[in-house]
């Protein structure tokens, strides 16, 4: 039975040209995290494997940095980066947990962070 929950940074906004940290946190489970995948829509951004470390997709090396922790930093943001991002936690023995973050990249200099929320 999957008892864990993924807490994410929720709906967030950031300025064009700036950076943003995408963060997820798995709680309420003792399952071992074996790997975390970060996706934008259906595109792989990065993998953090417990044994092998970080794999940053060669398509995104110029604009993606690993961390902090199991999170992911997006740099040099453009309006095309607006959209859904997913953290996919592969765990043993529970299985897979997925968190969703919606990022809006704004032209304006005012970019406010949304509230944190949970996805069961």
């Amino acid at each position: 039975m999957m008892t864990g929950t993924i807490e994410t940074t929720g709906n967030i906004s950031a300025e064009k040209g700036g950076s943003i940290i995408l963060q997820c946190h798995l709680s309420s489970t003792t399952a071992q995290v074996t790997q975390v995948n970060w996706e934008q829509q259906d595109q792989l951004l990065a993998i953090c494997n417990a044994d092998l470390g970080w794999h940053i997709s060669p398509s995104f090396k110029d604009r993606v940095a690993p961390g902090p922790g199991l999170g992911l930093t997006l740099q040099s943001l453009t309006v095309n980066d607006t959209g859904e991002y997913f953290c996919i936690y592969h765990t043993y023995p529970d299985g897979t947990y997925t968190g969703r973050i919606f990022l809006e990249v704004l032209e304006s200099s005012v970019a406010e962070h949304g509230a944190r929320f949970q996805i069961p």
Partner: antibody, heavy 118, light 113 residues
């Protein structure tokens, strides 16, 4: 020990398709990317594409886009490369190799010679 | 696409010689986040699959003799064989795995003088 064992040589006619297999053993198949590299006779090395069996993510060299399809069967730890609409220029040795992030391509299959001839 | 240019395309050397092969990329291969260069060197003998010698531009693969060393950063890289052995006569390729499509140099054939 880590091993990548490829299927045997193939002779195909122009316009046909070929499917080469690559059976992995000695490591966790779903942790590493499988890349496909080809080498025409007397020529250099050319990346065709890659697949991540742990998520079935794929990337293709645009040169082959639409003609090459990469798949993976996690139950048998086997990756496949299918190349369609074969032409004589596709005559080459096709290699599978594994890769993860920073560590480059550390183990290679023995290669599969595909000959395209009418 | 990142172009990889190797030189020389071939060279003749004797056992015991110091051999240097250079590789230049059309774009930097340095990933700022970890300060690593995504550049590898491979050795290939006739009829055999390539063998990984060096990754991250300068890190020797496990089991590779210490006479093989890699250096360089950004766009300019070097593979050095400090004392050529009979089994080292082969073709050497550099390869970038920084961005898609992954690309190789055209190869350097090391022949017996």
């Amino acid at each position: 020990q880590v091993q990548l064992v490829q299927s045997g040589a193939e002779v195909k006619k122009p316009g046909a398709s070929v499917k080469v297999s690559c059976k992995a053993s000695g490591y966790t198949f779903t942790n590493y990317w499988i890349l496909w590299i080809r080498q025409a006779p007397g020529q250099g090395l050319e990346w065709m594409g890659d697949i991540y069996p742990g998520g079935h993510y794929t990337n293709y060299n645009e040169k082959f886009q639409g003609r090459v399809t990469l798949t993976a069967d996690t139950s048998s730890s086997t990756a496949y490369m299918e190349l369609s609409s074969l032409r004589s220029e596709d005559t080459a040795v096709y290699y599978c190799t594994r890769y993860y992030g920073p560590y480059a391509m550390d183990y290679w299959g023995q290669g599969t010679l595909v000959t395209v001839s009418s | 696409d990142i172009q990889m240019t190797q030189s020389p395309s071939s060279l003749s050397a004797s056992v015991g010689d110091r051999v240097t092969i250079t590789c230049r990329s059309s774009q930097s291969l340095l990933y700022n986040s970890n300060q690593k260069n995504y550049l590898a060197w491979y050795q290939q003998k006739p009829g055999k699959a390539p063998k990984l010698l060096i990754y991250w531009a300068s890190t020797g693969e496990s089991g590779v003799p210490s006479r093989f060393s890699g250096s360089g950063s950004g766009t300019d890289f070097t593979l050095t064989i400090s004392s050529l052995q009979p089994e080292d006569f082969a073709t050497y390729y550099c390869q970038q795995y920084y961005s898609y499509p992954f690309t190789f140099g055209q190869g350097t054939k090391v022949e017996i003088k």
